[in-house]
């Protein structure tokens, strides 16, 4: 017998999910319309382009990259779709209403839409330390919360330290990571007698996964470059990101094979090593001047990568109850981190060779920055894992986690799918 | 030589609209974002609005918000201003001007914006009855 | 939004002579990176306006060397070490740091 949608989450989810889907029509009723310009033709579709590759990225590459357990990949590929047409939705409105309101009205662009779909991208790196615990329901409230804590955190660091929207929105890999880990350490933790071979990747999943992965990888260099300023910026970031992660694809795979006692390579490894030169590079994909050095934080990236997936699993699966193979949010925590210090070192290098005594200066607000975006991830993420295990959510009994069957009709009740 | 060429200025009426247009040359016009300027009769400079050099990106003065739309054509090499409902206090000579950039990083490729580098001639806007 | 505030609004000097004008801004113009984001322009009559200093000490190309900019943070100054009478304009002050770009509200010199 196939274990039914608990009763009143069927109430619940579609009253909270229609609702919600109600009130953002009528706000962009009210307060939204389209930019009026004729634009250049050729340049309109340059710019759908990159918005394309966004959504490619979050819609196939998370959402496959998420997919690795064997019984719930149905979930995990639906439910951050789910999130992402939730997400940029909401990311849309927010960011109008937080930068352009005073008119009046908020112009949706191509690039409120590639702003907005960067911003979903932060839910849809952060869910993976909580997917297979929680329910659609609860995914609503963590879209809603992120993205409003992200926009918030972006607007201030635009004011206070005077950053470009590239650098504010490159503080998604560790705003994403750490808001992921803080939600997951409030859920509860235990995996229940029972369930250990859910939480277990399987063959086909775990294929799908890998194509998540590739597609990631193919648009990367769109993800880092999508926010620059002016072409010359975009192509640097291109060339420099596309090296990345070319040589983090090599360090992935050899290093997970080094690292294993018979030499062989692990999955769970290489879907999010491959990743991590770019990740590294985010940050200062643009300043970077020459191929050799992108190469090399691509090849520190990897190993650290790879090192960490063998070595903190372990611990983030006793203190935040996060499975094995879910190991994007302490994968990107640490690339993130990476990524910002070696902005700070580009910073204190350039400011050496200007002369201009500003080193300090520099630093101190670089920190700062990171410190914010860290502080914002931890207590919004604090408050919706709160929010979450609230009983209004029809939370998923702790016998269920990691089961499409809560979720999905499947006719035939197969259980190894 | 960079050049740029303002054009569609004119008199015309409160509430009506006008398209104000600047051809540019002598620059790869599609690498540069772009500003449109304007000046009062007798009175400083006023900051209208600026647009990225793909158009991705617009920022507007708030006395052109929801009224101005910046938009460009980089096949043409050319930028537009379409200006809405006009009031008399919009006459003023309208500049378009590009967007500068020097490359600062010693170390690095960092480009550091500062404003307008390169102004066009102006063209007239007097919005009367 | 940033306010710019040029002193004197109008200045007359003895060709030869040096020059000072002040800009005041209501927030400091020193980005993170070291620079100041602050430009003269200066609008010779009937002409549109050059760019004549930019992020706060640099000339632009073709500009005389008698033209320098100094300063830091909210308080910066234009010298004009010898005016010449090819010099009578008006001198603006911009800040480039964040849209809305504004400007000072004009130094008009003159020659006595």
């Known amino acids: 017998m196939s274990s039914k949608y608990p009763r009143s989450v069927r109430r619940c989810l579609p009253l909270w999910a229609l609702t919600l889907e109600a009130a953002l029509i009528l706000l962009f009723y009210f307060f939204t319309h389209y930019d009026a310009s004729l634009e250049d033709q050729k340049g309109l579709v340059a710019s759908y382009q990159v918005g394309q590759d966004l959504t490619v990225m979050a819609a196939i590459g998370l959402g496959f990259l998420t997919s690795s357990f064997r019984r719930h990949s149905w979930s995990s590929v639906a439910f951050n779709l789910f999130m992402l047409a939730l997400g940029v939705q909401w990311a849309i409105l927010l960011d109008g209403f937080l930068s352009q309101f005073p008119s009046g009205k908020v112009v949706i662009t191509l690039f409120s839409i590639r702003l907005a779909t960067m911003s979903a991208l932060s839910v849809l790196i952060s869910v993976d330390a909580v997917l297979g615990k929680v329910n659609l329901a609860q995914l609503v409230v963590m879209v809603l919360v992120e993205v409003t804590a992200l926009g918030n955190l972006r607007m201030v660091i635009s004011n206070i330290f005077n950053t470009d929207y590239h650098m504010n929105m490159m503080h998604i890999y560790v705003f994403a990571a750490y808001f992921g880990l803080s939600v997951a350490w409030c859920l509860p933790k235990p995996l229940p007698e029972g369930t250990e071979d859910k939480d277990q990747t399987a063959t086909i999943p775990s294929l799908s996964a890998m194509l998540g992965a590739l597609f990631l990888w193919m648009f990367w260099p769109s993800f880092n470059s999508a926010l620059l300023r002016s072409p010359i910026e975009r192509k640097n970031a291109v060339f420099n990101t596309y090296y990345a992660v070319a040589v983090s694809v090599v360090t992935a795979i050899s290093g997970s094979s080094l690292a294993h006692p018979q030499g062989k390579i692990s999955k769970t490894y290489v879907h999010s090593a491959v990743l991590a030169g770019g990740v590294a590079v985010g940050t200062s994909c643009h300043l970077i001047p020459s191929p050799w050095l992108a190469m090399v934080l691509g090849l520190v990236a990897g190993l650290i990568s790879v090192g960490g997936a063998k070595y903190l699993p372990g611990c983030c699966n006793r203190v935040l109850g996060i499975p094995h193979s879910s190991i994007m949010g302490y994968n990107f925590s640490l690339l993130g981190l990476l990524g910002e210090i070696i902005y700070i070192v580009l910073l204190v290098l350039d400011t050496v060779g200007a002369g201009n005594g500003m080193i300090g200066f520099q630093v101190l607000l670089s920190i700062g920055e990171l410190s914010l975006a860290i502080v914002i991830a931890l207590m919004s993420g604090l408050l919706t894992g709160l929010l979450l295990n609230l009983k209004i959510w029809k939370a998923p009994h702790e016998a269920k986690y990691f089961d499409d069957q809560v979720f999905w009709k499947f006719p035939h009740l197969a259980v190894g799918f | 030589q960079v050049q740029l060429v303002e054009s569609g200025g004119g008199v015309v009426q409160p509430g009506r609209s006008l398209r104000l247009s600047c051809a540019a040359s002598?620059?790869?016009?599609?690498?540069?974002?772009m500003h449109w300027v304007r000046q009062a009769p007798g009175k400083g400079l006023e900051w209208v609005a600026v647009?990225?050099?793909?158009?991705?990106?617009?920022y507007y003065a708030d006395s052109a918000k929801g009224r101005f739309t910046i938009s460009r054509d980089n096949s043409k090499n050319t930028l537009y201003l379409q200006m809405n409902s006009l009031r008399a206090e919009d006459t003023a000579v309208y500049y378009c001007?590009?967007?500068?950039?020097?490359?600062?990083?010693?170390?690095?490729?960092?480009?550091?914006?500062?404003?307008?580098?390169?102004w066009g001639q102006g063209t007239t806007v007097t919005v009367s009855s | 939004d940033v306010v710019m505030t040029q002193s004197p609004l109008s200045l007359p000097v003895t060709p030869g002579e040096p020059a000072s004008i002040s800009c005041r801004s209501s927030?400091?113009?020193?980005?993170?990176?070291?620079?100041?984001?602050l430009n003269w322009y200066l609008q010779k009559p009937g002409q549109s306006p050059q760019l004549l200093i930019y992020?706060?000490?640099n000339r632009a190309s073709g500009v005389p060397d008698r033209f320098s900019g100094s300063g830091s943070g909210t308080d910066f100054t234009l010298k004009i070490s010898g005016v010449e009478a090819e010099d009578v304009a008006f001198y603006y002050c911009?800040?480039?740091?964040?849209?809305?770009?504004?400007f000072g509200q004009g130094t008009k010199l003159e020659i006595k």
């Open positions: 001007a590009r967007d500068a950039s020097v490359l600062s990083g010693l170390v690095t490729r960092r480009l550091v914006y500062y404003g307008m580098d390169v």
């Open positions: 002598g620059f790869t016009f599609s690498s540069y974002g």
């Open positions: 647009i990225w050099f793909d158009g991705g990106n617009k």
């Open positions: 927030q400091s113009l020193l980005h993170r990176n070291g620079y100041n984001y």
């Open positions: 992020l706060g000490s």
């Open positions: 911009m800040q480039g740091l964040r849209t809305p770009y504004t």
